[in-house]
């Protein structure tokens, strides 16, 4: 059978400073069991952008409704974008465990920030 795929359809997104950026991510299966997290950058120095269970991410909201059943849409919106937010964002599926382990990453979406229109 098909293994879960993490789909980030947009290779790049360009947003004007001060606006919101929507980063799209869907998965093709509800298994394996485990959370989705968003990161900026790759490797050990990557920055956690959103983790549904722990942490405080005041600029990030989830696109899908919190009560949506069998949700496979893990897109996020980041508000009040600044040039410091530029980078490549990865949607990552984890396999549940102690601790959770990375299972599969999306291909990434590069966010570029345009100057605020005058």
């Amino acid at each position: 059978e098909e293994e879960l795929q993490v789909i980030q359809p947009d290779k790049s997104v360009s947003v004007a400073a001060g606006e919101s950026a929507i980063l799209h991510c869907t998965v093709t299966s509800l298994i394996p069991v485990g959370p989705i997290q968003w990161f900026r950058g790759a490797g050990p120095a990557r920055e956690l952008i959103y983790n549904q269970k722990e942490g405080h991410f005041p600029r990030v909201t989830t696109v899908s409704e919190s009560t949506k059943r069998e949700n496979m849409d893990f897109s996020i919106s980041i508000s009040n974008i600044t040039p410091a937010d530029a980078g490549t964002y990865y949607c990552v599926k984890f396999r549940k465990g102690s601790p959770d382990t990375e299972f599969k990453s999306g291909a990434g979406t590069e966010l570029s920030v345009r100057a605020k229109p005058s």
Epitope: I31, P32, V33, T62, S64, S66, N71, K96
Partner: antibody, heavy 120, light 108 residues
Framework: DVQLVESGGGVVRPGESLRLSCAAS????????MSWVRQAPGEGLEWVST??????YYADSVKGRFTISRDNSKNTLYLQMNSLRAEDTAVYYC???????????????WGLGTLVTVSS | EIVLTQSPATLSVSPGERVTFSCRAS??????IAWYQQKPGQAPRLLIY???SRDTGIPDRFSGSGSGTDFTLTISSLQSEDFGVYYC??????????FGGGTKVEIK
């Protein structure tokens, strides 16, 4: 309509083995986690085990004795129970896992259950 | 392991009465609570998930509320078919999934 039908229960002696099956229909079996939940006579509900893809999870009380597995080509969930004990006597329910938003899991469909009795 | 404590253990009520069940978690589970109804000789049936969302086909006399550690299931006007045992379950932190001990609703 979602249907879950358990089979394989019966009476066994302590130390013996039993394999339960759960035939699923009415949903895309291969993309959902599935679970076993049991209920001892006159008692409450106790989670036993969950399987995702090849990821498996067990209650401490059955770890090392029970094995959960699935055959997606047959839409069937299994529970292999070895080294059975008197305290494993219960109705065993097969349940489909469900998720909501970014979190989960709870159980939105249950079979009618199959009774396992462990007695000498 | 998160422990769920349901109270009371038994409720004796008459049809038409308002019924409230309590479920208390030993630690914060946010809104990751489900409620089930089980009638004698039957499998459990999902009523509420995410603390307050009714499952498909569940009558609106059933409602859930709460977050954190304290949760409530309310039946606004008990019908004869509502008698049975009600269980809460947490899915915030697992394994193991844990259930409360149940509240039995009897006819007064």
């Amino acid at each position: 309509d979602v249907q879950l039908v358990e089979s394989g229960g019966g009476v066994v002696r302590p130390g013996e083995s039993l394999r339960l099956s759960c035939a699923a229909s009415g949903f895309s079996f291969s993309i959902y986690a599935m679970s076993w939940v049991r209920q001892a006579p006159g008692e409450g509900l106790e989670w036993v085990s969950t399987i995702g893809a090849d990821d498996t999870y067990y209650a401490d009380s059955v770890k090392g004795r029970f094995t959960i597995s699935r055959d997606n080509s047959k839409n069937t969930l299994y529970l292999q129970m070895n080294s059975l004990r008197a305290e494993d006597t219960a109705v065993y329910y097969c349940a489909k896992d469900s998720t909501v938003g970014w979190s989960g899991d709870f159980f939105d469909y249950w079979g009618l259950g199959t009774l396992v009795t462990v007695s000498s | 392991e998160i422990v769920l404590t349901q109270s009371p253990a038994t409720l004796s009520v008459s049809p038409g009465e308002r019924v409230t069940f309590s479920c208390r978690a030993s630690q914060n589970v946010r809104s990751d609570i489900a409620w089930y109804q089980q009638k004698p000789g039957q499998a459990p049936r999902l009523l509420i998930y995410a603390a307050s969302s009714r499952d498909t086909g569940i009558p609106d006399r059933f409602s859930g509320s709460g977050s954190g550690t304290d949760f409530t299931l309310t039946i606004s006007s008990l019908q004869s078919e509502d008698f049975g045992v009600y269980y809460c379950q947490q899915y915030y932190d697992w394994p193991p999934f844990t259930f409360g001990g149940g509240t039995k609703v009897e006819i007064k």
